[in-house]
Structure formats: structure tokens, C-alpha cells
């Protein structure tokens, strides 16, 4: 089939001691091959400091996956979710303040 760019969605969930878990979800993309990783100040985190989801079919002939890491509250600006898919790339910031969801569709 033809290339379908991912919808990328970054969310935050509060955890204890001033730390938050940030999760980056990519969905509705084709083909299956994708790079999705957290960057701190533009540099990828080590693999062992991120949690990864499998790339799974989402039922529409496309795929979905996710990656998460833990950061200090107040340092959201330093972190971006980096996505590369079928020759396209993008960086997606962590929502700061009251906004806890950020969606972006790649074209």
C-alpha cells in the first residue's frame, strides 16, 4: 500500500517526587518501519532509560507504537519525541503547563 504518515501524540502523567512520565504515541502509520525515540536536548536517551511498546497493527491496515521515559517536572522543554518514518522526520515537544496533550499529523 501507499505510505501513511503517523499521527504523533505526546502526553504527560504525574508520578511521585516531582517526576512525570512522558509518553509518545505514533498511530495510523504505514509501512510498519518507524523510529520513535525520546531526546533530551536533542540527543537520544539510552535505550535502557526508555520504555518501548511493540509495533502493532491497529486494525485499519496501519500500525501503532509508543515510547515513554521519566523526566523532572518543570523540565518539559528539554524533551522531544523524535519520529522518522518513510523518509520524513519530526520532533514533538512535551506539552508544558496545563496542556497535557499534543497531537500532530505528518504530511
Amino acid at each position: 500500500g501507499s505510505t501513511v504518515p503517523p499521527m504523533v501524540n505526546v502526553t504527560c502523567s504525574e508520578v511521585s517526587e516531582g517526576n512525570i512520565t512522558v509518553t509518545c504515541r505514533a498511530s495510523s502509520f504505514y509501512p510498519r518501519n518507524i523510529t520513535l525515540t525520546w531526546r533530551q536536548d536533542g540527543v537520544s536517551l539510552s535505550h535502557n532509560t526508555q520504555q518501548w511498546g511493540d509495533v502493532l497493527p491497529d486494525g485499519n491496515g496501519t500500525y501503532q507504537t509508543w515510547v515513554a521515559t521519566r523526566i523532572r517536572q518543570g523540565e518539559e522543554q528539554r524533551f522531544t519525541c523524535y519520529m522518522e518514518h518513510s523518509g520524513n522526520h519530526g520532533t514533538h515537544p512535551v506539552p508544558s503547563g496545563n496542556s497535557h496533550h499534543h497531537h500532530h499529523h505528518h504530511h
Epitope: 517526576n19 533530551q40 536536548d41 540527543v43 537520544s44 536517551l45 539510552s46 535502557n48 528539554r78 522526520h89
Partner: antibody, heavy 118, light 112 residues
Framework: EIQLQQSGPELVKPGASVKVSCTAS????????IYWVKQSHGKSLEWIGY????????ISNQKFTGRATLTVDKSSSTAYLHLNSLTSEDSAVYYC???????????WGAGTTVTVSS | DILMTQTPLSLPVSLGDQASISCRSS???????????LEWYLQKPGQSPKLLIY???NRFSGVPDRFSGSGSGTDFTLKISRVEAEDLGVYYC?????????FGSGTKVEIK
């Protein structure tokens, strides 16, 4: 080959401003941040800040807040460091640098010497 | 700001010697998620710095295996197993776990 080409030396008067450029080649400019580092003569290195060329987002060392402005021109794959209200303390070599997958300053420009003198 | 203290400031060596440089941070530079962004750079006179080691112990592409990095928390070490003439210059440690990023004051490795 990945390269960062910096603008030439600058001699400026106290109180004036200067704009240093850093033109990237050999890679997709919006894939990687551009960092700026200061080195005063015979001294250590000082991180100024960085810019994400994809989003335009910046993070800076508070020491330089209000005096250093980081911008990019995506069409020419060029990053700029704009320094204002210059004093003799700003006389230094200014480097731009680019990270890699897991490291910060993997590629450096050759540096731009800024001399502040009346 | 996190202060990066390097010792010694000057390290006179004979070619073929082992050299060891210490870098101590004023607080732990292990980030919340376990990431430790500690790097080592070498700057030769009139040149831009060059990356040697990233994330404490990983050698950058093209860096000879006589260079090794180790440490954790607040204490880090760069070792050169057999110093060669091309290794002379100023070595800097650098932390990017916390903003502002900070460099050590430098260690000059020179011939005895």
C-alpha cells in the same frame, strides 16, 4: 561530509551587537539541534544554548539570557547567534556544534573570533 | 549550576605512559530516568575541541581504544593507556544532565 561553516572574525565596539552564522551541510538540517559554545582566550568552554531547527525552540544558559538570541533560517540551513550590548567580556571564540545520536558535540564549526574593542 | 572540577590542571607525561584525569561534579549527574550525560573532549592548540567519550564510557567513532572512560554519580575518570604525541592538548569533561550544561576547567597533558 557533515560540516558546520562559521562566519569570519568580527571586530566590534563596546555596546554594539554582532551576528555569528553557522551554515550546515551534509545532512538534513532540521534533524539535529545546533548548540553554541563560548571560549574566552586561554580559558575553558562555556555553553550558551541550543536551538531545535525543526520547531525553533530554544534553551539557553541563564547567564546569557537577554543578551544572546538564537535563530535559524531553514531555507539556507543556517543557525545564527546574535549577541547584543557587547563588552570586553564578550571577546571570545564562539563555536557552533551539532549532536549525534547519543552524544552532544560530535561535529564542531571552526569557531568565530569576536573582539570587542573601542 | 553544577561545578565540574578536574584534576590535575596540568599533567606532564612521557610518551608511552599511562595518564589519568579525574572529573568530579558538585552533585550527581544521573538524571531522573537514569541517563548520565558525561562526555570528554580534547582540544589541541588553534583547533576546535573533539569528542572522545560520550555517556561516561562510550568511545566516539574513530577514537583509539587507548582512551577509556569510567565512573558514576559524581566521580568520573578518563584514562589514556599509552600516551602518544597526538594525545597532547587540553582535556575537558562536560555534563549535560542538568541545565546549564557545564565544562570542567581543563587538564593540560604535556610532555615531561
Amino acid at each position: 561530509e557533515i560540516q558546520l561553516q562559521q562566519s569570519g572574525p568580527e571586530l566590534v565596539k563596546p555596546g554594539a551587537s554582532v551576528k555569528v552564522s553557522c551554515t550546515a551541510s551534509g545532512y538534513a538540517f532540521t534533524k539535529y539541534n545546533i548548540y553554541w559554545v563560548k571560549q574566552s582566550h586561554g580559558k575553558s568552554l562555556e555553553w550558551i544554548g541550543y536551538i531545535d531547527p525543526y520547531t525553533g525552540g530554544t534553551i539557553s544558559n541563564q547567564k546569557f539570557t537577554g543578551r544572546a538570541t538564537l535563530t535559524v533560517d531553514k531555507s539556507s540551513s543556517t543557525a545564527y547567534l546574535h549577541l547584543n550590548s557587547l563588552t570586553s567580556e564578550d571577546s571570545a571564540v564562539y563555536y557552533c556544534a551539532r549532536p549525534g545520536s547519543y552524544w552532544y558535540f560530535g561535529v564542531w564549526g571552526a569557531g568565530t573570533t569576536v573582539t570587542v574593542s573601542s | 549550576d553544577i561545578l565540574m572540577t578536574q584534576t590535575p590542571l596540568s599533567l606532564p607525561v612521557s610518551l608511552g605512559d599511562q595518564a589519568s584525569i579525574s572529573c568530579r561534579s558538585s552533585q550527581s549527574i544521573v538524571y531522573t530516568n537514569g541517563n548520565t550525560n558525561l562526555e570528554w573532549y580534547l582540544q589541541k592548540p588553534g583547533q576546535s575541541p573533539k569528542l572522545l567519550i560520550y555517556k561516561v564510557s562510550n568511545r566516539f567513532s574513530g577514537v583509539p581504544d587507548r582512551f577509556s572512560g569510567s565512573g558514576s554519580g559524581t566521580d568520573f575518570t578518563l584514562k589514556i593507556s599509552r600516551v602518544e604525541a597526538e594525545d597532547l592538548g587540553v582535556y575537558y569533561c562536560f555534563q549535560a544532565s542538568y541545565v546549564p550544561f557545564t565544562f570542567g576547567s581543563g587538564t593540560k597533558v604535556e610532555i615531561k
